[in-house]
């Protein structure tokens, strides 16, 4: 007969998720209200469009990007949506509590929804390393811990290093990558006999993963510019991100062909590498003074991404138990670091140009921020991994990793596997 959730999880998941949702509703009831001061309705529409772009990136882009497994595509898309919906709610409250609460109620604006969507995106990046090996109850825990850790990281960085919204949110790439990798490291690693086929990619899901990559590619300029403060900064960010992702597409496809003995193009490389430029340019997208620099950065990022996709999966599979097609984690970790290094280079160049003696101090601050982001990601990721290993969550048995049938009702299937 077809496989079902174990009885205990069938009781635990709805109870856990609905209790949490009820708690969130109560928190919203007591502690939040809308910003009532908006005068300009046209401004509202323009502001909403940015948030809409971010939601499309999260729900469709990252949802489908992670759906390339042969027998785990439904779960990838739907679980992403579930995590996004939960993550946004908690992120809005958390950001409000951390930044506004002493002054009374949390004021909800379109900007706070934007911030919350970006915080939830962090979870969707991280989860790529563990999707297929965890159930929804475990994912709820992951969402809560990661959003909380990122929110606190952003607050600490903002207060200690005096970093603005854009700069402290751009640590998301490195944070999400290291968080996901450290969670994966804690989970049972060896794929048992008989499941090797399930973590392979198939044509239809791979096509939907490519669709996800295309949506991310289209909207990455919105992501990189969403939190910037002035039109000129947003314009620079949009242009530079666009040039960087355009070049990384060309690099990804040609680099993938170059990396294959028969000159064939790998779907997995392309899914991930097309986004490389957007990640690498993120931190400094509003500061890069001319298009050619963004394009060079896109080229380098594309090459690093393809190189990483070729040589790192073996290591990641052995050490972390991450399947070959889930390369977002190490990809974003490398490219996020590249982006941070580019920012430090710009910092040094600018400071030298100004003939100022503050170089060491500024560089130290930037390295401090980055180190803090990595440390908090690793620590909170390990904590999450340990929590997910608790028996209470009734994790899927290793023989049922990467399998939609464990979670979904398929009426046309008479029997299981």
């Amino acid at each position: 007969m077809s496989s079902k959730y174990p009885r205990s999880v069938r009781r635990c998941l709805p109870l856990w998720a609905l209790t949490l949702e009820a708690a969130l509703i109560l928190l919203f009831y007591f502690f939040t209200h809308y910003d009532a001061s908006l005068e300009d309705q046209k401004g509202l529409v323009a502001s909403y469009q940015v948030g809409q772009d971010l939601t499309v990136m999260a729900a469709i882009g990252l949802g489908f990007l992670t759906s390339s497994f042969r027998r785990h595509s439904w779960s990838s898309v739907a679980f992403n949506l579930f995590m996004l919906a939960l993550g946004v709610q908690w992120a809005i409250l958390l950001d409000g509590f951390l930044s506004q609460f002493p002054s009374g109620k949390v004021v909800i604006t379109l900007f706070s929804i934007r911030l919350a969507t970006m915080s939830a995106l962090s979870v969707l990046i991280s989860v790529d390393a563990v999707l297929g090996k965890v159930n929804l109850a475990q994912l709820v825990v992951m969402v809560l811990v990661e959003v909380t850790a990122l929110g606190n990281l952003r607050m600490v960085i903002s207060n200690i290093f005096n970093t603005d919204y854009h700069m402290n949110m751009m640590h998301i790439y490195v944070f999400a990558a290291y968080f996901g990798l450290s969670v994966a490291w804690c989970l049972p690693k060896p794929l048992p006999e008989g499941t090797e086929d399930k973590d392979q990619t198939a044509t239809i899901p791979s096509l939907s993963a490519m669709l996800g990559a295309l949506f991310l590619w289209m909207f990455w300029p919105s992501f990189n510019s969403a939190l910037l403060r002035s039109p000129i900064e947003r314009k620079n960010a949009v242009f530079n991100t666009y040039y960087a992702v355009a070049v990384s597409v060309v690099t990804a496809i040609s680099g993938s062909s170059l990396a294959h003995p028969q000159g064939k193009i790998s779907k997995t490389y392309v899914h991930s590498a097309v986004l490389a430029g957007g990640v690498a340019v993120g931190t400094s997208c509003h500061l890069i003074p001319s298009p050619w620099l963004a394009m060079v950065l896109g080229l380098v990022a594309g090459l690093i991404s393809v190189g990483g996709a070729k040589y790192l999966p073996g290591c990641c599979n052995r050490v972390l138990g991450i399947p070959h097609s889930s390369i977002m984690g190490y990809n974003f970790s490398l490219l996020g670091l590249l982006g941070e290094i580019i920012y430090i280079v710009l910092l040094v160049l600018d400071t030298v140009g100004a003939g100022n003696g503050m170089i060491g101090f500024q560089v130290l601050l930037s390295i401090g921020e980055l180190s803090l982001a990595i440390v908090i990601a690793l620590m909170s990721g390990l904590l999450t991994g340990l929590l997910l290993n608790l028996k209470i969550w009734k994790a899927p048995h290793e023989a049922k990793y990467f399998d939609d049938q464990v979670f979904w009702k398929f009426p046309h299937l008479a029997v299981g596997f």
């Epitope: 300009d40 934007r114 005096n162 919204y165 002035s230 400094s284 100004a354 100022n356």
Partner: antibody, heavy 125, light 107 residues
């Protein structure tokens, strides 16, 4: 020519409300962040609030947080300051100021390049 | 960051070289601006980014410094320069603050 013109000031009793307006001309209003700065009689300048170019973000000085609300209507080229629960210490000349920027090192630096002439608010019983 | 200006008032003569200092309670890099205000008038921007002269401002005004110590220098005082001068930091993107002001008077 860039112009900022404040209005709405006057005498008001403690605990009451007042709404200041700042109508601008001579530049594209929706490209700039805007600020309110005040100056109590015989005292120095005190920053009050800022609103981003698209109205998406607002910050306030601790002394006015929860009582004052900054807003803008880009279609009317107008900046507002809604002042509730006014106190005697809110008595001041209120200036609106345009925020401009320069790219410096690896960040943008902001400064106030144009100011209005100010409107006097007197809170007295 | 708190800003402290010194001196709080200063008497000088036309033609004098005058220096006003502004000290920040923590490092603010070069995120410091200087304004001039005459009685009954709105403030006017003189210097931004610690040392950049605003267009239309006479070249006798200059700014320097970074980190915590900044100076505004008027190389040769003119009659129209007698006013109150304020420093202002924009390092903290949530909080802008001004110094308490330096009143420059005719000796």
């Amino acid at each position: 020519e860039v112009q900022l013109l404040e209005s709405g000031g006057g005498v008001v009793q403690p605990g009451r409300s007042l709404r200041l307006s700042c109508v601008v001309s001579g530049f594209t209003f929706n490209n700039y962040g805007m600020h309110w700065v005040r100056q109590a009689p015989g005292k120095g300048l005190e920053w009050v609030a800022v609103i981003w170019f698209d109205g998406s973000n607002k910050y306030y000085a601790d002394s006015v947080k929860g009582r004052f609300t900054i807003s803008r209507d880009n279609s009317k080229n107008t900046l507002y300051l809604q002042m509730n629960s006014l106190r005697a210490e809110d008595t001041a000349v209120y200036y609106c100021a345009r925020e401009n920027q320069i790219k410096l090192w690896s960040r943008y630096l902001y400064y106030f390049d144009y100011w209005g002439q100010g409107t006097l608010v007197t809170v007295s019983s | 960051a708190e800003l402290t200006q010194s001196p709080s008032s200063l008497s000088a003569s036309v033609g004098d070289r005058v220096t006003i200092t502004c000290r920040a309670s923590q490092s603010i890099s070069s995120y410091l601006n200087w304004y001039q205000q005459k009685p009954g008038k709105a403030p006017k921007l003189l210097i931004y980014a610690a040392s950049s002269l605003q267009s239309g401002v006479p070249s006798r005004f200059s700014g320097s410094g970074s980190g915590t110590d900044f100076t505004l220098t008027i190389s040769s005082l003119q009659p129209e320069d007698f006013a109150t001068y304020y420093c202002q930091q924009s390092y903290s993107f949530r909080r802008y603050s001004f110094g308490q002001g330096t009143k420059l008077e005719i000796k």
